[in-house]
């Protein structure tokens, strides 16, 4: 089942996806697509990286972090109801059927208040309970006991005060990444 994320119309949506490169600069191609991850590649690609850089990008879809260090999280700017749906983050590990596939469900809610056109802070209202844990074998999805003991309601409240980047870093620091190699 997909992990669910929420954002309001007019906000930025944040979809986290991380991996740990086997060695500095030893990057793995990553694609983001609209729709569940197919058998190969990404369907309806919105952003793609290769072993060096972003090589395909579409309007409103941005890499949110330091992708050279494995933070391939996606920001979708100024979301509308049409942005609801499943998104695929695919970490294209070399070898047959080695790819790591993450399906993330984005739920867009109508705006409670009219958002300001320019914001210094953007956030996604909910963060995952299920994340891929760091490990050397096949990635295994499970609830992370090491995450801070905060429920979704609390995170939703905190999100108004904390940057999505800060929470994302906290999640990653808790071990919410996969290691390549």
């Amino acid at each position: 089942s997909e992990v669910e994320y929420r954002a309001e119309v007019g906000q930025n949506a944040y979809l986290p996806c991380f991996y740990t490169p086997a060695a500095p600069g030893n990057l793995v191609p990553v694609c983001w697509g609209k729709g569940a991850c197919p058998v190969f590649e990404c369907g309806n690609v919105v952003l793609r990286t290769d072993e060096r850089d972003v090589n395909y990008w579409t309007s409103r879809y941005w890499l949110n972090g330091d992708f050279r260090k494995g933070d391939v999280s996606l920001t979708i700017e100024n979301v509308t109801l049409a942005d609801s749906g499943i998104y695929c983050c695919r970490i294209q590990i070399p070898g047959i059927m080695n790819d790591e596939k993450f399906n993330l469900k984005l739920v867009i809610k109508p705006a409670k208040v009219t958002p300001a056109p320019t914001r210094q802070r953007d956030f996604t209202a909910a963060f995952p309970r299920m994340l891929t844990t760091r490990g050397h074998g096949p990635a295994e999805t499970q609830t992370l006991g090491s995450l801070p003991d905060i429920n979704l309601t609390q995170i939703s409240t905190l999100a108004n005060e904390l940057r999505d980047s800060r929470l994302a870093n906290d999640l990653r620091d808790s071990g919410a990444t996969i290691r390549i190699g």
């Epitope: 930025n12 600069g25 990008w57 330091d66 700017e77 320019t118 914001r119």
Partner: antibody, heavy 122, light 109 residues
């Protein structure tokens, strides 16, 4: 060829205001985060402010927060910096700089303008 | 807040190798970018993402980053390399871009 051309600098009294502009050409302006970086005479580079490609999100150094406002007009390929409540310590050459492709914050500064001098003095 | 530390100056003879460091807590976990600035001119990107070189930058310029130190290496130094060099990172916890305070590279002779 990528070009960034700043304008709007000059002499202003403490407490005054100034608006800097940066005219961009040679690339798809709306696809890139943009920043302002300043350098006081003989001093280090200091990042001032950044704005996402669409203009939807803005970021400021603590030293200018609440006084400076970054904005952009993608139809005119122009970046702006509105500077209010100017102080002597804001005296610097102000550069506009383009971020990297496909990244929300820009990550690094691939291209720079030649800068415009802002002098705050009575 | 995150701090980047650079030596104020480095001196090197022509033809030798100059190494300019940039220190920061676990800086190896961040991407580091390097700029060259000559007097009266705008900065120029010379290394990005730790070790990548923009087109037009000589192969003599290289970079590395691990642990608490990033290093810009200039081999076979020439008189024209004399400049200030700045390291830069994006601190995602504050969403601020940070620069080191620069290192003045002096080419002797």
């Amino acid at each position: 060829e990528v070009q960034l051309l700043e304008s709007g600098g000059g002499l202003v009294q403490p407490g005054g205001s100034l608006r800097l502009s940066c005219a961009a050409s040679g690339f798809t302006f709306s696809s890139y985060a943009m920043s302002w970086v300043r350098q006081a005479p003989g001093k280090c580079l200091e990042w001032v402010s950044a704005i996402s490609g669409s203009g939807g999100s803005t970021y400021y150094a603590d030293s200018v927060k609440g006084r400076f406002t970054i904005s952009r007009d993608n139809s005119k390929n122009t970046l702006y910096l509105q500077m209010n409540s100017l102080r002597a310590e804001d005296t610097a050459v102000y550069y506009c700089a383009r971020g990297s492709y496909g990244t929300y914050y820009g990550n690094y500064f691939e291209y720079w303008g030649q800068g415009t001098l802002v002098t705050v003095s009575s | 807040s995150y701090v980047l530390t650079q030596p104020p100056s480095v001196s090197v003879a022509p033809g030798k190798t100059a190494r300019i460091t940039c220190g920061g807590d676990n800086i190896g976990g961040k991407s580091v970018h390097w700029y060259q600035q000559k007097p009266g001119q705008a900065p120029v990107l010379v290394i990005y993402y730790d070790s990548d070189r923009p087109s037009g930058i000589p192969e003599r310029f290289s970079g590395s980053n691990s642990g608490n130190t990033a290093t810009l290496t200039i081999s076979r130094v020439e008189a024209g390399d004399e400049a200030d060099y700045y390291c830069q990172v994006l601190d995602r916890r504050s969403d601020h871009f940070l620069f080191g305070c620069g290192t003045k590279l002096t080419v002797l002779g």
